[in-house]
C-alpha cells in the first residue's frame, strides 16, 4: 500500500527575468527514491537519478540548474514559463508519486511566493 504524500511549494509567482526554485518533498513513507522527473506540462525538464545523477534536457540546459537537493532551479524566467510543473517520484517498492506546482511569471515586481502546502498524491503503481 502506498502511504506517502508529496508536499510541494504549491502555487508560486516570480518576476520575469528572475529565478525560482521548484521543490517537492516525499514524506510518510520509507520507500527509497530511485528517480525524480521534473516536467512542464508534457515536456521533460530534468531527471535526477539516484545512481546516475542529473539529466537536464538540452532544450533547457542554459537556464535550468539542478538542485537544491532533488529540486530544480529555473532561471531567466519569461512569461511563457507560466504554467503547471510536475515532480514525479519513482520509488521502491511503492511506485510513482506525482506532485504539482503552478508557477505564474509576472511582469511587475509584485510577485509573491504562495504558502507551502500539501496536495493529495497521484500515483501509478507498478
Amino acid at each position: 500500500m502506498m502511504t506517502g504524500t508529496i508536499e510541494t511549494t504549491g502555487n508560486i509567482s516570480a518576476e520575469k527575468g528572475g529565478s525560482i526554485i521548484l521543490q517537492c518533498h516525499l514524506s510518510s513513507t520509507t520507500a527509497q527514491v530511485t528517480q525524480v522527473n521534473w516536467e512542464q506540462q508534457d515536456q521533460l525538464l530534468a531527471i535526477c537519478n539516484a545512481d546516475l545523477g542529473w539529466h537536464i534536457s538540452p532544450s533547457f540546459k542554459d537556464r535550468v540548474a539542478p538542485g537544491p537537493g532533488l529540486g530544480l532551479t529555473l532561471q531567466s524566467l519569461t512569461v511563457n514559463d507560466t504554467g503547471e510543473y510536475f515532480c514525479i517520484y519513482h520509488t521502491y517498492p511503492d511506485g510513482t508519486y506525482t506532485g504539482r506546482i503552478f508557477l505564474e511569471v509576472l511582469e511587475s515586481s509584485v510577485a509573491e511566493h504562495g504558502a507551502r502546502f500539501q496536495i493529495p498524491h497521484h500515483h501509478h503503481h507498478h
Epitope: 521533460l44 531527471i47 537519478n49 545523477g53 534536457s57 538540452p58 540546459k61 521502491y92 507498478h126
Partner: antibody, heavy 119, light 107 residues
C-alpha cells in the same frame, strides 16, 4: 548533422593505458551529456560511464571506476576516455555516444575505436 | 546490477513478415528502455527510447511496447535492410546495462 568522430585504432601492452578521443560537431557540445560504451568481440555492449561536458561532472560503472577517467575539452568539443592498467580482456571496440533529449539513453554514436591489448 | 535477457537469441523471418523480439528485465524499470540496431561492422543505431517512442528518422514499421519488466520490439514487415543484431538497454540506473542481443536474418 550530428557527428562524433573518434580517434584511430590502438595496440597496447598489458599494464599500459589508452586514451581515446571523440570530437563532436553539428550541435552544442555542452548541452548534451556524453557516454562511453565498449563491445568486446562477440559480446554485448557494456556501459562505462557518462560526463556532463558543461560542468565536467562524471558518473562511472563501478566495474571500471578505479581504471577509467572521462574528461572533456570544451574548446575543441572533444570528449576523452582513458583506461589504465590494461589487460587482454579490455580488447574491444570503444564507442562514444551522445545522451538523448529525454533521458540516459544514447541517440548518436561514434564510429568506434578498436583497442587491442596484447603482449 | 539490472540484468537484461533477450529472446530469441536469433530468428529468421521472411521478407514482409513480422519479427518480434522480447526483452525481460530483472526489476521494474517503468518505461525506461531503449532498443538499438547494430549492423555488422557498424555502430549501434537508436530505434526506440522510453519503451515506445520512435527515434527520429526510424521507419514506422518498427514499434516498441511494454513497461515494468517485459518489453517487445516489433518489425511489422521485415525488409532486407533490417538484417542486424538488436539490443535492448535500460536507461534507469547505474550501471546502464544491455541485453545480449537478438540476431535477425532473412528466411
Amino acid at each position: 548533422e550530428v557527428q562524433l568522430v573518434q580517434s584511430g585504432a590502438e595496440v597496447k601492452k598489458p599494464g599500459a593505458s589508452v586514451k581515446v578521443s571523440c570530437k563532436a560537431s553539428g550541435y552544442t557540445f555542452t548541452n548534451y551529456y556524453m557516454h562511453w560504451v565498449r563491445q568486446a568481440p562477440g559480446q554485448r555492449l557494456e556501459w562505462m560511464g557518462r560526463i556532463d561536458p558543461d560542468s565536467g561532472g562524471s558518473k562511472y560503472n563501478e566495474k571500471f571506476k578505479s581504471r577509467v577517467t572521462i574528461t572533456v575539452d570544451k574548446l575543441s568539443s572533444t570528449a576523452y576516455m582513458e583506461l589504465s592498467s590494461l589487460r587482454s580482456e579490455d580488447t574491444a571496440v570503444y564507442y562514444c555516444a551522445r545522451e538523448g533529449h529525454y533521458g540516459f539513453y544514447s541517440d548518436y554514436w561514434g564510429q568506434g575505436t578498436t583497442v587491442t591489448v596484447s603482449s | 546490477d539490472i540484468v537484461m535477457t533477450q529472446s530469441p537469441d536469433s530468428l529468421a523471418v521472411s521478407l514482409g513478415e513480422r519479427a518480434t523480439i522480447n526483452c525481460r528485465v530483472s526489476e521494474n524499470i517503468y518505461s525506461y528502455l531503449a532498443w538499438y540496431q547494430q549492423k555488422p561492422g557498424q555502430s549501434p543505431k537508436l530505434l526506440v527510447y522510453n519503451a515506445k517512442t520512435l527515434a527520429e528518422g526510424v521507419p514506422d514499421r518498427f514499434s516498441g511496447s511494454g513497461s515494468g519488466t517485459d518489453f517487445t520490439l516489433t518489425i511489422s514487415s521485415l525488409q532486407a535492410e533490417d538484417v542486424a543484431v538488436y539490443y535492448c538497454q535500460h536507461h534507469y540506473g547505474n550501471p546502464l546495462t544491455f541485453g545480449p542481443g537478438t540476431k535477425v536474418d532473412i528466411k
